[in-house]
């Protein structure tokens, strides 16, 4: 056929966000005389992308010199592509007319898809700390990627996790997508130094996945263990009792000594010993003047850790036989409201 044909050789083109997209279009004839235009979409809702005749299209450049004699190449390049540029582009030939040019022929259309990198994954943990053996949830979010296909994995200390749920939104085609994943992690006492990692793989990342991390130290509370013991006597009328507070995390700790239920001294943990697993130890001591007591004394070490309900351990100091340096210890949780956190 001699009649002009509009040839768009590519049915589809895929471009990375930020790059330029070349949309090819060629005419088979110089006749009829008239301009070409590029549109995104068709029909009543179409959007003008380029008009050879008039207008300002700062992101569009022509691949060849359109004013050149005998030019049949009407390909365009669109710079700085964003996901919002995705769609089907039509190269349309107009016939010169008066007063207006008349549409004459359209190309078959080229579908432009945009490859956009996902944003750096943001991992967030629970709002409140949990104790070992409990399950906490971590979320991972990344946005702005295209195409929709994406892979997300969770790791804890390098070991892949399986208990997680992932959603990619929206469900249908869109200019760009978001991913949201929630992983469930069971805490152990040794997790103070542990880390969870959300790893995202996408075609735009060329095999170099993005990672977001969260430290379990911000999610875990390891409650202390208490041990009250009597130390060897320094003087005949003095008993030295110590309270060993072990393996707690985080650091915040307030300790109160009670003699027969009456507050003797309150102190805040300052010089702590850090263990290899990230937990802390602390020791407090109490000197009891045995001359001041006729009867046995119950000494209680009460610890409030990280704003939680106080736990305590008691020790019965036998005054009548204090020279024997022995007593008995009693453990209980204090059924009183915790003191205000420091």
């Amino acid at each position: 056929e001699d009649e002009l044909q509009v040839i768009q050789p590519e049915k589809s083109v895929s471009v990375a966000a930020g790059e330029s997209a070349t949309l090819r279009c060629a005419m088979t004839s110089l006749i009829p005389v008239g301009p070409i235009m590029w549109f995104r979409g068709a029909g009543a809702g179409r959007e003008l992308i380029y008009n050879q005749k008039e207008g300002h299209f700062p992101r569009v450049t022509t691949v060849s010199e359109l004013t050149k004699r005998n030019n049949l190449d009407f390909s365009i390049s669109i710079s700085n592509i964003t996901p919002a540029d995705a769609g089907t582009y039509y190269c349309v030939k107009f016939r010169k007319g008066s007063p207006d040019d008349v549409e004459f022929k359209s190309g078959a259309g080229t579908e432009l898809s945009v490859r956009a990198k996902p944003s750096a994954p943001v991992v967030s943990g629970p709002a409140v700390r949990a104790t070992p053996e409990h399950t906490v949830s971590f979320t991972c979010e990344s946005h702005g990627f295209s195409p929709r296909d994406i892979t997300l994995k969770w790791f804890k200390n390098g070991n892949e996790l399986s208990d997680f749920q992932t959603n990619v939104d929206p469900a249908g085609d869109s200019v760009s997508y978001s991913i949201h994943s929630t992983a469930r992690v069971v805490l152990t006492r040794g997790d103070v130094h542990s880390q969870v990692i959300c790893e995202i793989a996408h075609i735009t990342l060329q095999g170099d996945p993005l990672r977001g991390t969260a430290n379990l130290s911000e999610a875990i509370r390891v409650p202390p263990t208490l041990e009250v013991t009597q130390q060897p006597m320094r003087a005949e009328n003095q008993a030295n009792v110590t309270c060993q507070v072990s393996n707690f995390y985080p650091r915040g700790l307030q300790l109160t000594w009670l003699e027969n239920g009456n507050v003797s001294r309150t102190e805040t943990a300052s010089t702590l010993i850090e263990n290899k697993d990230g937990t802390y130890n602390w020791m407090s001591w109490l000197l009891v003047n045995t001359c001041a007591h006729r009867d046995d004394v119950v000494l209680t070490c009460q610890v409030e850790h990280d704003g939680q309900q106080a736990v305590s351990k008691s020790y019965a100091l036998e005054i009548s036989a204090h020279q024997k340096e022995h007593g008995s210890d009693i453990t209980h949780e204090a059924a009183l409201a915790p003191t205000a956190p420091l």
């Epitope: 979409g41 068709a42 029909g43 009543a44 809702g45 179409r46 995705a86 769609g87 089907t88 039509y90 349309v92 008349v102 549409e103 004459f104 022929k105 359209s106 190309g107 078959a108 259309g109 579908e111 929206p170 469900a171 249908g172 085609d173 869109s174 200019v175």
Partner: antibody, heavy 123, light 106 residues
Framework: QIQLVQSGPELKKPGETVKISCRAS????????MSWVKQAPGKGLRWMGW????????TCADDFKGRFAFSLETSATTAYLQIHNLTNEDTATYFC????????????????WGQGTLVTVSA | IVMTQSQKFMSTTIRDRVSITCKAS??????VAWYQQKSGQSPKLLIY???NRYTGVPDRFTGSGSGTDFTLTISNMQSEDLADYFC?????????FGSGTKLAIK
Amino acid sequence: QIQLVQSGPELKKPGETVKISCRASGYTFTTYGMSWVKQAPGKGLRWMGWINTYSGVSTCADDFKGRFAFSLETSATTAYLQIHNLTNEDTATYFCARDPHSYGNSPAWFPYWGQGTLVTVSA
Amino acid sequence: IVMTQSQKFMSTTIRDRVSITCKASQNVGISVAWYQQKSGQSPKLLIYSASNRYTGVPDRFTGSGSGTDFTLTISNMQSEDLADYFCQQYSSYPLTFGSGTKLAIK
């Protein structure tokens, strides 16, 4: 492959309501707009309107405003046409038809059609 | 916009060249599609943008025209082409179809 499968024929009395379904498969349902087209026996085709399957927003042609409603069940990849207060003039075959353009463009031509649902309104 | 297909019926013979016309009541550019519909079946897209053959459509089907006058040509009529043919404009809302042209054997 891409398919639009419509519900079976309906026999209704004047004044009743009918709801026709169009189940889509073979593509991402919320990608492409869905139009509805009416064809009375022995007559031509009339575009009734369309529903944007991504936003759920529907547009009715002026001749089909009032008694006609388009809806979606996205999880079931299904579009619906509901006609209230049926009259004899509603006797026709109703087609669902899918648009060629993704990304929310307005409807243009229709490369994919359902097999049609015949609605007969008779006292 | 009214799409007028003035020929309600057209008689033809196998291997004949057939031209079906469609006239728009106002300028629709090239925003025209053509469909084929066989008895008891749903319409099938043949042409879009006035002259672009849809995927899988035999090349004996050709569309032409712009503005207000459009033509669908079947260059080598086959028995399987006996059907109703509808034009449709998508230049403005509401989308409108022609009343159809029925092809029959002489």
